[in-house]
């Protein structure tokens, strides 16, 4: 399987909400012995590998933000902890996997990574990640709502969470 980022850059005004999205696609085994662990974290564009370092999102670690289920099942974080920090991660039946961040501040700017781990009974884990940049802007140059720039350099798109 692979992970695709629908957008590589999100530019948002301060105070707005945004939903960052990844999609799991390709052959996904829905058998009993396969489960998927999905999570989000902040990172940096490392010299060797992007998304190698795992930093918290608003003080919540990747452990706090994870989803865990079999196949393309739907799931979302019910953790009060995440919601108290204005965060919620979710996954649908179609392989879409997202994190919503509410009331953005300049401190939220940075590189965000989605991580998917496929766990197969008695096999090595298969890890895949996607990366996207969030830029939170303030002042007269800030857009009126979030603008998302597709990964394959097509036209930008206005989005709301």
């Amino acid at each position: 399987f692979k992970v695709a980022t629908l957008y590589s850059l999100y530019v948002c005004p301060e105070g707005q909400n945004v939903t960052l999205t990844c999609r799991v696609f390709g052959p996904v085994d829905k058998g009993h012995d396969v489960t998927f662990y999905k999570t989000w974290y902040r990172s940096s564009r490392g010299e060797v590998q992007t998304c190698s370092e795992r930093r918290p999102i608003r003080n919540l670690t990747f452990q706090d933000l994870h989803l865990h289920h079999g196949g393309h099942q739907a799931a979302n974080t019910s953790h009060d902890l995440a919601q108290r920090h204005g965060l919620e991660s979710a996954s649908d039946h179609h392989g879409n996997f997202s994190i919503t961040m509410r009331n953005l501040t300049l401190l939220d700017s940075g590189l965000y990574c989605c991580l998917v781990v496929e766990i197969r009974h008695h096999h090595s884990e298969h890890r895949v990640h996607g990366a996207m940049e969030l830029q939170v802007q303030t002042g007269k140059d800030a857009p009126s709502s979030c603008v998302a720039y597709p990964s394959s350099s097509q036209e930008s798109e206005n989005i709301t969470a």
């Epitope: 662990y37 865990h68 096999h123």
Partner: antibody, heavy 118, light 107 residues
């Protein structure tokens, strides 16, 4: 306080049984996979067994397969290791450790000593 | 099973000196390797994850590198509290395996 506390170790004769417990606190235990890892006196670390957050799948090291059983009770925030047919080579400090897919053992207990001797 | 071989078995150094520890895997573990520190009477502590990333709260004097089969942990300038045993561990394959450890002792 985020911690793991093992108990249940002690002196047992070869062929005997023991049940180790690990009490978790300060984090959402049911979110985590867990492992037992042991360390024979003056020796290195050996992974023993692993259990997912839901209780399945479960894995064992070949050295304990068929003799040890790992289990958990998420309602009690507890992890267990039932050890049967104990041998002298099972003598070790047994640690429980927190685990996650695509991650490492980021939280360990202080360990409990199991001595198998006649 | 993947065998991890650490060298040297013992490293005798003075505070302030640089320590270089090696871990070699019998087959590739990609970058799925961690380093732990263990002091006498204590449980191990995660130092490095995914071959080169410092875990939360680990000082910058600890650094690590490598991928595939050859990995290195470096302590740039030894502090008194760094004298301990260091283990590498892989999670690329079952079973999870550890190296036999390198003891860093005061010279």
């Amino acid at each position: 306080q985020v911690q793991l506390v093992e108990s249940g170790g002690g002196l047992v004769k070869p062929g005997g049984s023991l049940r180790l417990s690990c009490a978790a606190s300060g984090f959402t235990f049911s979110d985590y996979y867990m492992s037992w890892i042991r360390q024979a006196p003056g020796k290195g670390l050996e992974w023993v067994s692993y259990i997912s957050n839901s209780g399945s799948p479960i894995y064992y090291a070949d050295s304990v397969k068929g003799r040890f059983t790992i289990s958990r009770d998420n309602a009690k925030n507890s992890l267990y290791l039932q050890m049967n047919s104990l041998r002298a080579e099972d003598t070790a400090v047994y640690y429980c450790a927190r685990d996650l897919p695509g991650w490492y053992f980021d939280l360990w207990g202080r360990g409990t000593l199991v001595t198998v001797s006649s | 099973e993947i065998v991890l071989t650490q060298s040297p078995a013992t490293l005798s150094l003075s505070p302030g000196e640089r320590a270089t520890l090696s871990c070699r895997a019998s087959q590739s573990v990609s970058s799925y390797l961690a380093w732990y520190q263990q002091k006498p009477g204590q449980a191990p502590r995660l130092l490095i994850y995914d071959a080169s990333n410092r875990a939360t709260g680990i000082p910058a004097r600890f650094s690590a590198s490598g991928s595939g089969t050859d990995f290195t942990l470096t302590i740039s300038s030894l502090e008194p509290e760094d004298f301990a045993v260091y283990y590498c561990q892989q999670r690329n394959n079952w079973p999870r395996t550890f190296g036999q450890g390198t003891k860093v002792e005061i010279k």
